[in-house]
Every structure is written in structure tokens, then in C-alpha cells.
């Protein structure tokens, strides 16, 4: 069962007291059938809300939208509709925030009817908007340079891409028939067109492009493109082999100049290709099987993002809908968490420690019985719900949560036994990066970190009656503390926090509803009360992180460093603070083979740390396609994995020569590749059909 | 296996100070906190302080605030208690303790240094 | 600081008894207590942490429980080596303090 709230449990004196004085109700006198929020810049307490309501009348949509604005987190809120002309502003993508602490925002407003459109844009964090016509009307959310906020790129309903160097004062087209388009670094934009004017049904016939100017000069870098992604350092395109149908991944680290076949599968037109995560040292890819299976294999990347091992097999990735359950744990170094299709057809959750090499089962909670789904009562794992689990239905209010400054911390909904449970979920949290768990919470709940993990809060999922309460850890989860924020309960929608986890407020968003009547209410809850001092360095303990064996020299060892951190005792009721910075110290590690992947042509026989010689390859020179040169392969199977910084102990030796010979895939070389100058080619317009999951780097 | 070594036992005049030292093998040094901890002849246990020597942290009880000094040199594994102004009743057994692992068992001390007796007589 | 009192301050019991010594903290310590067992001139050994978590190496005979003020530690049948000093000690807030010990004799 999950910790009791009993009075003795980590009991925070006179709390109620203490939040009833810092409990912020505002109503918002609207009707509106939705509600969308956005903090505008980080530390500056600026929200933005914005409430749409729509009818669909005949052939179009008659909308009505207002606009509200606060600056102290929440706890009030001011109409500033009257500063964009009371003009509708659409939900879908209506509010794009600038990168950074730029305080620039953008609302794109909906003029039925019309062959442009109009924004309204602030430089100032909201306070104040000017009302700029577009020669347009954008397909997507206006898109940020995030290297200069003042230059914005949009793409149009013909497909054509426009640009503005003045943060949207004035606008050039800069191509037509532009199917994707994105921004890299340095203002670099990437994007891929097609000359025959349709991106839907030409999809492998896609030219892809690049300017580093603005628009004044173009390069072609790829053609026969079916999609492109880019991830950390990576610039990765999907490309149409020639044989037939079949597509191959080719990686490029210099923005497209150069490109080197990716050592992955080829796949058909029904397959896919997903970037699940990446940084500037690797990549994880997801590579669809054959047929509708709905699954596919995890390959990791070398630092190059060229040779791939194989990282986890029937990795679970929908193509109905594109749903991964891939979850990055940001609270910890190497740290990630997925599902897998078992043979039973089962879901099953899986977990790694070092960013791919190995994956396991999750440790089922000591204080936690297998269900009904365990062979055996005794063994078992836990499951984590995610994104599939909220695709099937299942009541999961929210994906798992990890928060960077909050170390070692996960938050996730699960259950135990031998796979993914349909019955309800119950919330469990680990505080050492997912190597532990322990139940939480009995039953579904929203749930966000607070004051860099000083405080979790939690709110129950109740869909068919009102909520009233509120339940608060100031222990990791350990103990919760229930409060009563209101007398008379409220339709629940959603909690918000300012992303970042460095606030120490928490906005309860709902509905009150009657006969006759609907309105908006939130409710702000300021911990700093909860919190009453500053922490101190006596709050503080050391943590190394990875531990599994204190005997051992290497313990903690992971990607070649182990890291201490100080990190807040549980017992302390303390504020992190706003400006809190994690304090961790590196200590590097003696290499072992763990700490190399297989080389090119060579592969780890399962529960083996030796690389061995592929069998097809034995006795072959190992000669690849690399940066459009082949290169001869001298190696005894070994190469570091990237981010590794492990020194001495085992060294494998490589070598790598260049034979002087060119060679291409079925990409343009880069001595055929072409410039032209700054002219709009003809087309018209299509889909694009690539999507950003969420977390997802990039999926065709 | 891993060993906490004390220095051998001393004998003060009041007034003076001593150093105790807590040498440790096995494990890495640097992952842990060390805490003092000494007893009185056929009393209890107190707690003195707490060092973390990789990012060297040192907290004292307010009792011995002001008296109590722990260092420790991260190159020879080795952690240090210097208590001055001696006075008779400071006549005990002193030990060090490192913490246990893990984070829901900091302060729990798992191992312990065999202990040092420091007499306080004139 | 958080005072610990242990009851009996000491005890006569014979193999196979069970025994229970208590603990009761001067404030709410939520589960961040430990016990300890310690014989004539040897140092303490950790036997439970967090109110009810068995060290490991120690025999299933010796359990924790409680939350709060007051908590309690069994010896569920008493073995020749059991009989020493426990102490219990809170590391909610510093300063970390110990009970003042239980003497387990033999009767």
C-alpha cells in the first residue's frame, strides 16, 4: 500500500494555516469551451491564458477568444483582450512564446474568409501588442530561430515558406512547394520542396534545402528525400535507395555538405524511421518492422551517427497513431524507460542505466504485491504507463515526470505483474533514477514537481465528481499531506506549474457548472510558507548516483564517470530556492569493454561484454561509405561509445584508412550538389504528414 | 571489504587539543560521509559532526561548535576530528562512522572505525 | 535538538523470550530511525534503518516498527548473542541524536 497520511508521518506543522493564507482564487467570467496557458520567459511570474470558444456553423467556424494576463504566477489575472482588438485568436496554435527570456509572443488570430492573415506581437512580455497583416495564412505555429528571437519562419496552407527577419514587421516568401521546414543552428534553415507541387503523394521524390542567409542563397544537399530530421548535432534524412520502395537513413554533422550512409536497415513504404532521443554525442533510432506490427528495434548511435548497435528489439512504437512509451528520465544520467511487445503480445516495461547498452525489467516495489497478470506471485516487475497506455484509454492522466534539477526523482503511473495492467493505475516515485520505486499514491493523479523536488503535489483524477483537495510531499513522496483548497469542490482539467520545476507555485485549473451557468476558476497555492527557510548545507547529503555495490571501487561507474551529488535530505523542510544549481562532482572511471560498443561489422553475443566478428563479414575488408569517401577498416571490433569518458584500463586499438576512392550512396555528391540564388519555384500546395511526437526528435 | 582504521589512544592535558584520525580501505573514500560519534565511559552515544569530504562539507551539533574541527584528505582516504580546549568530562571513547548507502539510509552508520580513547587528566 | 528516551532502560530476559525495547522521539521524526546494538568494548552495528528496514546480515528474528514519536524494536525469540545495549538514534534534523540505551541482560 501507499504511505498513510497519518499524523505522524512527515507531518507539516500548522500547514493548513499556512496555505489557506496563500490560496489565490480567480474566476474567469467566460463561457469559453477552452482553455489554453503559456508562461511567458522563466522567473518572471507572466502567464498568459487564453480561452476559446467555437461553433461550427454550416461551412465555417464562427469563434470567439479571450485573453487574460498575470504576473505574479497565477494567483491574478487581468482581461487584456481589448489589446488585440478582441480579435479570435486560435487555440491550436495561436500562442508561440519566444526562446529564452526574450519576452516576445506571437498570437495568430483567425480571419475566416480571408487570403491572409494577422498577428498580434509583444516585445514586452505581453504588456503591450501591435497588430501586423500577414500575406498568408500559416499552416503550423509560427516557428522561432532559437539562436535570435526576432527571426521567425512560418509555413503557409499553399505550402509556401515565408521568413521575417523583424520578428514579424515584415515577411518574404522564400520557396513554394515547401512540404517541412525547421530551423537548425547558427539561423540555418532546412527544408524540403517539390518541384511536381504536391508533398503527399510524392513523398522520396523531396529535394532537400538549405540557406544560411535568410533566404538570399540556397544549396540543394539532398535529393530522392523522404523526410529529414534533426537531432543534436545530427542532420539525418531518409532516403529513397533505388531499389524499389526501400529507404535508407544517411547522417550528415555539417549541416549537409557532407553525408555517410547510416548502418541501419533499409525499410519499406510502410515502415518508418524515429529519432527517440539524441544529443550532441549520439542518437537512439527506432527502426519499424516489416508489416503492421507495431514494433520495431532501438539501435544506439557511435558519435558519428553512423554505426548503430542493436539496443533493444520489439520495441513497442504504434503506427496508428505513433505511440512510443520512449521516456528520457532527465532526473539522471543515462537513464531511460520504454515498453516492449512481448511474444504474448503483452506490454512490458523496460528500463536502461547506460543510455541503451543494456535494458532490464523495472524492480518491483517493496511495498507492492503482483497482480492478478504474474505467473508468479513473487516475481515480478513494474510497469509504466505512457504514452500507449493514454492512446488505449486507459485512465492515465500523465506521462512520467523527471525534472533535470530535481535529481534522481521519477513520477509515473504503473502497475505490478508480468506486463501493463488495464486495471487502475497507482502512482509510484523513485528517488534514485528508477533503480527503486515505491508506491505513492492509491489511484490515478496529475501530479508536478515543485522547488527543484522540494515539494511534489498531487491532485487526484476524479472524472465524475468535483475536486476539493490537494495532496503535498514535502519528503519525495514519501508522506503526503492532504489540504482542502476549496469548500465547494471544482471540475478538475489540469495543474500548472511554470516548467522548469523552480516555483514554488501550483495552479489548480477547473470549472464550476450549473444549469444555466459555466465559468473558469483557478486556484494558486504558494508553498513559500510550507517552505519557511532557506536550505542550508546541513540539508544537504551526498548521493552517488548508479550506486549498486558500495564494495566495489567501480561503483556508480557509468559511461565511463561516476557522479556525487548533493542532494536535499528528506527530512529537510527547506526552500531550494529559485536559483537553486545542482551540486554534483564527476570522478572519471578505469575503462572496461562496457565501455565500448561493437565497431562496424561486429556484434556482442547476448549476456557477453566481446565484441565478435559478424559471420557474414569474416575475412572481408571492412570497407564503408564515409563522408563520401571509402574508408578501409582496421579494427579488433571495439569502439567507444560516445560520451564516454573512461581512461586507462582496457584499450582497444583502431584504425581507420582513407582509400582515396569516392563513393556515393544514392545521395548527390557534394561536388554535384547545387546553389542558386533566391528565386520562388513554381508548385502548389499539399500535407505535410511528419509530426513531432512529443519527446520525439523525429518521426517520417 | 570495507575497514575504517582509528588512530591509537591518547592521553591530554585540559586545556589542549587532539586529532584523531579515520583512515578507510575498501570502497571508494570520496562516495560517503564520515561522522564522529563518541561515548563516554559506561554512557551513551553523541553525535560530534559530519564531513563529506568530496565536496568538503563539514557540520557540527551546536554543542561543540567552535571546539570541534573535521577535515579529511581525499588522497590518503583519510578523515580527521581535532577537538581543543579539552576539559576532563571530554574523557571518551571516539569513534568515526561512515553513512549507509543509499539515500533513504544517510546518517545511518553501517561502518564503523574500531574507536579511539582520548583521556583528559591533568 | 530532538531527544530520544528508551524504555526499559534495562531488561532481564532468557533465550527464546521475545523482547520489545521502545523509543519515543521529543518531536515527529516521521520513519528516520535507526537502531543499534552494541557489545562491551566494540562498536555499534546497525541493525534496522528507516523505522522497519533490516541491515543486511541481520538475522529475521529482529524487527522495527512505528512512525511519528514512537517506535519499537523485537527481538522475536532471544538468542545467546542478542544479549548487549541498543540504542535507537533519529536522523530527521540535525543534531543527529541517539536513546541513552537499553541493557539487555541475561535473567
Known amino acids: 500500500s501507499a504511505p498513510g497520511e497519518d499524523e505522524e508521518c512527515g507531518r507539516v506543522r500548522d500547514f493548513v494555516a499556512k496555505l489557506a493564507n496563500n490560496t489565490h482564487q480567480h474566476i474567469f467570467n467566460d463561457l469559453s469551451g477552452s482553455v489554453s496557458l503559456s508562461w511567458v520567459g522563466d522567473s518572471t511570474g507572466v502567464i498568459l491564458v487564453l480561452t476559446t470558444f467555437q461553433v461550427p456553423i454550416f461551412m465555417i467556424t464562427i469563434g470567439q477568444s479571450k485573453l487574460y494576463r498575470s504576473e505574479d504566477y497565477g494567483k491574478n489575472f487581468k482581461d487584456i483582450t481589448d489589446l488585440i482588438n478582441n480579435t479570435f485568436i486560435r487555440s491550436d496554435f495561436g500562442i508561440a512564446i519566444g526562446p529564452e527570456n526574450s519576452g516576445k509572443v506571437v498570437l495568430t488570430a483567425d480571419v475566416s474568409g480571408s487570403h491572409g492573415s494577422r498577428i498580434f506581437r509583444s516585445s514586452d512580455f505581453a504588456k503591450n501588442f501591435v497588430q501586423q497583416e500577414l500575406p498568408f495564412v500559416p499552416l503550423m505555429q509560427i516557428m522561432y530561430s532559437p539562436q535570435n528571437s526576432d527571426y521567425l519562419l512560418a509555413l503557409s496552407n499553399k505550402n509556401e515558406l515565408w521568413v521575417s527577419k523583424n520578428f514579424g514587421g515584415k515577411w518574404e516568401k522564400l520557396y513554394d512547394t515547401v512540404c517541412l521546414a525547421k530551423w537548425g543552428s547558427d539561423n540555418t534553415i532546412f527544408f524540403t520542396a517539390n518541384h511536381n507541387g504536391s508533398c503527399s503523394n510524392d513523398r522520396g521524390m523531396l529535394e532537400l534545402w538549405r540557406t544560411s542567409d535568410l533566404g538570399k542563397s540556397f544549396k540543394t544537399i539532398g535529393s530522392k528525400i523522404y523526410s529529414f530530421g534533426l537531432g543534436g548535432r545530427f542532420l539525418f534524412a531518409s532516403v529513397m535507395t533505388g531499389k524499389g520502395t526501400l529507404r535508407a537513413i544517411h547522417v550528415s554533422t555539417d549541416q549537409g555538405d557532407t553525408w555517410s550512409m547510416a548502418q541501419l536497415p533499409p525499410v519499406g513504404h510502410e515502415q518508418f524511421y524515429s529519432i527517440l532521443a539524441a544529443n550532441d554525442d549520439m542518437v537512439f533510432m527506432h527502426v519499424d518492422e516489416p508489416g503492421d506490427s507495431g514494433f520495431g528495434t532501438i539501435f544506439t548511435s557511435d558519435d558519428r551517427g553512423i554505426v548503430y548497435s542493436k539496443s533493444l528489439e520489439r520495441h513497442l512504437y504504434t503506427t496508428t497513431g505513433g505511440e512510443t512509451d520512449f521516456t528520457n528520465v532527465t532526473s539522471l544520467r543515462g537513464v531511460y524507460i520504454t515498453s516492449i511487445l512481448a511474444e504474448d503480445k503483452s506490454v512490458q516495461s523496460m528500463i536502461t542505466f547506460d543510455q541503451g547498452g543494456r535494458w532490464t525489467h523495472l524492480r518491483k516495489p517493496e511495498n507492492s504485491k503482483c497482480d492478478a497478470t504474474a505467473r508468479d506471485p513473487e516475481k515480478c516487475s513494474l510497469h509504466i504507463h505512457a504514452a500507449y497506455s493514454i492512446a488505449t484509454g486507459l485512465n492515465v492522466p500523465m506521462l512520467p515526470l523527471s525534472e533535470p534539477n530535481a535529481v534522481g526523482i521519477v513520477i509515473a503511473h504503473g502497475s505490478v505483474g508480468d506486463a501493463i495492467s488495464v486495471m487502475r493505475p497507482d502512482v509510484y516515485i523513485s528517488d534514485d533514477g528508477g533503480y527503486s520505486w515505491t508506491k505513492a499514491l492509491e489511484g490515478p493523479h496529475h501530479y508536478t514537481i515543485l522547488d527543484s523536488g522540494g515539494i511534489i503535489v498531487a491532485v487526484e483524477q476524479n472524472a465524475h465528481q468535483g475536486v476539493n483537495q490537494i495532496k503535498f510531499s514535502t519528503d519525495e513522496g514519501q508522506c503526503w499531506q492532504t489540504y482542502n483548497f476549496t469548500k465547494d469542490p471544482i471540475f478538475f482539467t489540469g495543474l500548472a506549474s511554470e516548467p522548469g520545476a523552480r516555483s514554488m507555485n501550483i495552479s489548480i485549473w477547473g470549472y464550476r457548472s450549473s444549469l444555466f451557468h459555466q465559468y473558469w476558476i483557478s486556484y494558486t497555492i504558494d508553498f513559500k510558507d510550507i517552505l519557511e527557510r532557506n536550505c542550508e548545507e546541513k540539508d544537504y547529503t551526498i548521493w552517488l548516483a548508479h550506486s549498486t555495490d558500495p564494495e566495489d571501487y567501480e561503483d556508480g561507474c557509468i559511461l565511463g564517470y561516476k557522479e556525487q551529488f548533493l542532494r536535499l535530505r528528506k527530512s529537510s523542510v527547506c526552500q531550494n530556492g529559485r536559483d537553486y544549481v545542482v551540486t554534483k562532482q564527476p570522478s572519471i572511471c578505469l575503462c572496461s569493454l562496457e565501455d565500448f560498443l561493437c565497431d562496424f561489422g561486429y556484434y556482442r553475443p547476448e549476456n557477453d561484454s566481446k565484441c565478435v566478428e559478424q559471420p557474414e563479414l569474416k575475412g572481408h575488408d571492412l570497407e564503408f561509405c564515409l563522408y563520401g569517401r571509402e574508408e578501409h577498416l582496421t579494427t579488433n571490433g571495439y569502439r567507444k561509445i560516445p560520451g564516454d569518458k573512461c581512461q586507462g584500463g582496457v584499450n582497444p586499438v583502431r584504425e581507420v584508412k582513407d582509400l582515396k576512392k569516392k563513393c556515393t550512396s544514392n545521395f548527390l555528391s557534394p561536388e554535384k550538389q547545387n546553389s542558386k540564388s533566391n528565386g520562388s519555384a513554381g508548385g502548389s500546395g499539399g500535407l505535410n504528414d511528419i509530426f513531432e511526437a512529443q519527446k520525439i526528435e523525429w518521426h517520417e | 571489504q570495507v575497514q575504517l582504521v582509528q588512530s591509537g589512544a591518547e592521553v591530554k592535558k585540559p586545556g589542549s587539543s587532539v586529532k584523531v584520525s579515520c583512515k578507510a580501505s575498501?570502497?571508494?573514500?570520496?562516495?560517503?560521509?564520515i561522522s564522529w560519534v563518541r561515548q563516554a565511559p559506561g554512557q551513551g552515544l553523541e553525535w560530534m559532526g559530519r564531513i563529506i569530504p568530496i565536496f568538503g562539507i563539514a557540520n557540527y551539533a551546536q554543542k561543540f561548535q567552535g571546539r570541534v574541527t573535521i577535515t579529511a584528505d581525499k588522497s590518503t582516504s583519510t578523515a580527521y576530528m581535532e577537538l581543543s580546549s579539552l576539559r576532563s568530562e571530554d574523557t571518551a571513547v571516539y569513534y568515526c562512522?561512515?553513512?549507509?548507502?543509499?539515500?533513504?539510509?544517510?546518517?545511518?552508520?553501517?561502518?564503523w572505525g574500531q574507536g579511539t580513547l582520548v583521556t583528559v587528566s591533568s | 535538538d530532538i531527544q530520544m528516551t528508551q524504555s526499559p532502560s534495562s531488561l532481564s530476559a532468557s533465550v527464546g523470550d521475545r523482547v520489545t525495547i521502545t523509543c519515543r522521539a521529543s518531536?515527529?521524526?516521521?520513519?528516520?530511525l535507526a537502531w543499534y546494538q552494541q557489545k562491551p568494548e566494540k562498536a555499534p552495528k546497525s541493525l534496522i534503518y528507516?523505522?522497519?528496514s533490516l541491515q543486511s546480515g541481520v538475522p529475521s528474528r529482529f524487527s522495527g516498527s512505528g512512525s511519528g514519536t514512537d517506535f519499537t524494536l523485537t527481538i522475536s525469540s532471544l538468542q545467546p548473542e542478542d544479549f548487549a545495549t541498543y540504542y535507537c538514534?533519529?536522523?530527521?534534523?540535525?543534531?543527529?541524536?541517539f536513546g541513552q540505551g537499553t541493557r539487555l541482560e541475561i535473567k
Open positions: 528507516a523505522t522497519s
Open positions: 575498501g570502497g571508494t573514500f570520496s562516495n560517503y560521509a
Open positions: 538514534q533519529q536522523y530527521n534534523s540535525y543534531p543527529i541524536t
Open positions: 562512522a561512515r553513512d549507509r548507502r543509499g539515500f533513504s539510509g544517510y546518517e545511518v552508520f553501517d561502518y
Open positions: 518531536q515527529g521524526i516521521s520513519s528516520w
